[in-house]
Interface confidence: medium
Amino acid sequence: TKEDPNPPITNLRMKAKAQQLTWDLNRNVTDIECVKDADYSMPAVNNSYCQFGAISLCEVTNYTVRVANPPFSTWILFPENSGREGTAAQNFSCFIYNADLMNCTWARGPTAPRDVQYFLYIRNSKRRREIRCPYYIQDSGTHVGCHLDNLSGLTSRNYFLVNGTSREIGIQFFDSLLDTKKIERFNPPSNVTVRCNTTHCLVRWKQPRTYQKLSYLDFQYQLDVHRKNTQPGTENLLINVSGDLENRYNFPSSEPRAKHSVKIRAADVRILNWSSWSEAIEFGSDDGNLGSV
């Protein structure tokens, strides 16, 4: 298309801190929309800017502004991630544990200079509040992780940014959007008990406390029932149990019964990121000649 000699919009730019795509409007137009890649579209506020919620400061993204009348469009790429290739933090990962703690870790970029320092910022999707890392994990003075003991500022999806600084060269940044449900590691189930009568054994347990607000339907459990003093390589009995209001599993086991142990682990039914196993609970007799469960 031929370039408009008098475009209605000029000086398209991103105000990164405010997360606003803004421009100069040179004449009256009807309806302006902003499009991020193809994925998100939004109407402009008073035809003067678009307010975004979670712009990436690392992933180069196309931002297009379209005018309905007169028909016109223009675009920019943001950001232009400056800094030497390979200097950004890498192998970034976070996990929530013990229901209210989070650790994030990363590694120094392969081409980062010796004086590189990294800083972690977290922004939630709703309140646009920025959380700065309160406690850094260090390796030879370089920040390579972060510990948070207050997760009240997080929402279901959060934006993580690792910035870098150096006196020698520009450092690229790393960013990522993470869902809390995908990064939470459950504690094992608690209060595991086994009660047996002459014919059956009943295992009960409590669902683990979690950061997410989950119902019993969101849990899946695995029970590992293991007979003691068996030959190496003998298979354990792994039982899958769906979460219930009262978590219990009843299985036939007649007296006299050999010594067994049971341990349980938990996962989100949709993700199946298993927790560690609970402490093994033993039941039955020490006599190795008795029957199995």
Epitope: D31, D37, Y40, S41, M42, P43, G53, S125, K126
Partner: antibody
Framework: EVKLVESGGDLVKPGGSLKLSCAAS????????MSWVRQNSEKRLEWVAT????????YYPDSVKGRFTISRDNAKDSLYLQMSSLNSEDTAMYYC??????????????????WGQGTLVTVSS | DILLTQSPAILSVSPGTRVSFSCRAS??????IHWYQQRPNGFPRLLIK???ESISGIPSRFSGSGSGTDFTLNINSVESEDIADYYC?????????FGAGTKLELK
């Protein structure tokens, strides 16, 4: 319950024109971007057109640009596709599709949350 | 245009088994991949959005994963009602494009 009902499919000669309609119900039509997607006899899906909730902005792939026009009448809860200069490659089942709800102020118009049953367009002499 | 390649073209499985569908993009699309199911003589139905986000009303046996160029749709334990064609679609850039589909059939 979201319901999309397409109509207007027919047998048309090459070079001819046709207008498809889609009647929407079960949701606030004026709040959602809408699209047309077609599927040929080999079952290939192809996105054809998208219009934003207010009707000001339209999107087309190069294969139909200049020949097809998507429009909507929010007062009638209806979506339309005006097709002209039709050729045999336009033979397909045409589906009307609703985009997702708005999300933090964004209008997600790039994936298809609900589909109609389709209306068949055959271009042949 | 971004080309999406789905493999295999046909998958034959026994009921109760786990099955995986692959979708590969010709360039990085982040997580902007969506999955649809189309049963015989039916219309497409959204299963998974943004690579791994679940959809209300879709059975929990369906899950998705992947980012960049490689994506997977999993069915935990196939049921007879899952016999259908499965399509991926990208929304990273215009034009929106679909894969050619994978047909799931029972052994």
């Amino acid at each position: 319950e979201v319901k999309l009902v397409e109509s207007g499919g027919d047998l048309v000669k090459p070079g001819g024109s046709l207008k498809l309609s889609c009647a929407a119900s079960g949701f606030t039509f004026s709040n959602y971007a809408m699209s047309w997607v077609r599927q040929n006899s080999e079952k290939r899906l192809e996105w054809v057109a998208t219009i934003n909730s207010g009707g000001s902005f339209t999107y087309y792939p190069d294969s139909v640009k200049g020949r097809f026009t998507i429009s909507r009448d929010n007062a009638k809860d209806s979506l339309y596709l005006q097709m002209s200069s039709l050729n045999s490659e336009d033979t397909a089942m045409y589906y009307c599709a609703r985009q997702s709800e708005a999300y933090y102020g964004y209008d997600k118009r790039t994936w298809f949350a609900y589909w109609g049953q389709g209306t068949l367009v055959t271009v042949s002499s | 245009d971004i080309l999406l390649t789905q493999s295999p073209a046909i998958l034959s499985v026994s009921p109760g088994t786990r099955v995986s569908f692959s979708c590969r993009a010709s360039q990085s699309v982040g997580t902007s991949i969506h999955w649809y199911q189309q049963r015989p003589n039916g219309f497409p139905r959204l299963l998974i959005k943004y690579a791994s986000e679940s959809i209300s009303g879709i059975p929990s046996r369906f899950s998705g994963s992947g980012s960049g160029t490689d994506f997977t749709l999993n069915i935990n334990s196939v049921e007879s009602e899952d016999i259908a064609d499965y399509y991926c679609q990208q929304s990273k850039s215009w034009p929106l494009t679909f894969g050619a589909g994978t047909k799931l059939e029972l052994k």
